[in-house]
C-alpha cells in the first residue's frame, strides 16, 4: 500500500487517501446511477474481512464492458499485492451467493466508510 | 449475437417437480460461467444457481440448496434447472444468464407458478 499512485495524483499515495479515493469513486457510482448498474449484472458476493479487497476484486473483475466500475476495478487492484484476473478466485473466496453490482458496490461502501472512520485505512 | 432461450415453465402443484431448459447461442458456452435467476412478482431480481463451464462446479442459493439442482449439456448448448419440492414462493419468472452480463443478455425468461 506504499505505492497507490495514479489516481488523483503522481507518486507514492498515503493509504488514507487511497481508501479515500475510492470512497469517493463508490459514493460517485451509487449517486450518479440512474438505469441498473451494470445492466443488473450478478457477481459473487464478499466475506468483508479479512483479503477484502481483494477478494472485491476478484468478483468485480468478472463483469467487462461496464464502464462504470473500471476505476473501481483499476483502484482495488492497488489494494491487492496480487495480479488478480478474470475467474480466479482465492481460498478465502467463499462463493455462496450472487448479488447485483449496485448491492455489491453499496455494501463494500458502507464497509469502507466504517473502516475510514476507525483509521483503518489498510 | 448473444441469445438464449429458456423453456419448461407452467403451473405445477406444491410439492411437484419441473425441468427448465435453456437453449444458448451466439457465444461459446462451453467456456462460460452459467446463471439461473429470478423474480418474482412485485420482487427484485434473485440469483437461484450458477455452474461452472464444464459443469462441475455448482452453487446454490440457500433458498433452493437440496431441491434443485443445476447441469449443462455442452454438446447441446444447453443449460438445465431440476426443481424438485416446489414452494408457493418459487412462484417466479425464470431467466438463464450468461454469467456476470447484465439483463441485456438474458432470456426472455419462462413463468413457473406453484399452486395447488
Known amino acids: 500500500l506504499t505505492c497507490l499512485g495514479g489516481f488523483a495524483s503522481p507518486g507514492p499515495v498515503p493509504p488514507s487517501t487511497a481508501l479515500r479515493e475510492l470512497i469517493e469513486e463508490l459514493v460517485n457510482i451509487t449517486q450518479n446511477q440512474k438505469a441498473p448498474l451494470c445492466n443488473g449484472s450478478m457477481v459473487w458476493s464478499i466475506n468483508l474481512t479479512a483479503g477484502m479487497y481483494c477478494a472485491a476484486l476478484e468478483s468485480l473483475i468478472n463483469v467487462s464492458g461496464c464502464s462504470a466500475i473500471e476505476k473501481t476495478q483499476r483502484m482495488l487492484s492497488g489494494f491487492c499485492p496480487h495480479k488478480v484476473s478474470a475467474g480466479q478466485f482465492s481460498s478465502l473466496h467463499v462463493r455462496d451467493t450472487k448479488i447485483e453490482v449496485a448491492q455489491f458496490v453499496k455494501d463494500l461502501l458502507l464497509h469502507l466508510k466504517k473502516l475510514f472512520r476507525e483509521g483503518q485505512f489498510n | 449475437e448473444v441469445q438464449l432461450l429458456e423453456s419448461g415453465g407452467g403451473l405445477v402443484q406444491p410439492g411437484g417437480s419441473m425441468r427448465l431448459s435453456c437453449a444458448a447461442s451466439g457465444f461459446t458456452f462451453r467456456d462460460y460461467e452459467m446463471d439461473w435467476v429470478r423474480q418474482a412478482p412485485g420482487k427484485g431480481r434473485e440469483w437461484v444457481s450458477s455452474?461452472?463451464?464444464?459443469?462441475?462446479?455448482?452453487w446454490y442459493a440457500d433458498s433452493v440448496k437440496g431441491r434443485f439442482t443445476i447441469s449443462r449439456d455442452n454438446s447441446k448448448n444447453t443449460l438445465y434447472l431440476q426443481m424438485n419440492s416446489l414452494r408457493a414462493e418459487d412462484t417466479a419468472v425464470y431467466y438463464c444468464?450468461?454469467?456476470?452480463?447484465?439483463?441485456?443478455?438474458w432470456g426472455q425468461g419462462t413463468l413457473v407458478t406453484v399452486s395447488s
Open positions: 455452474i461452472g463451464p464444464s459443469g462441475s462446479e455448482t
Open positions: 444468464a450468461k454469467a456476470y452480463t447484465g439483463f441485456g443478455y
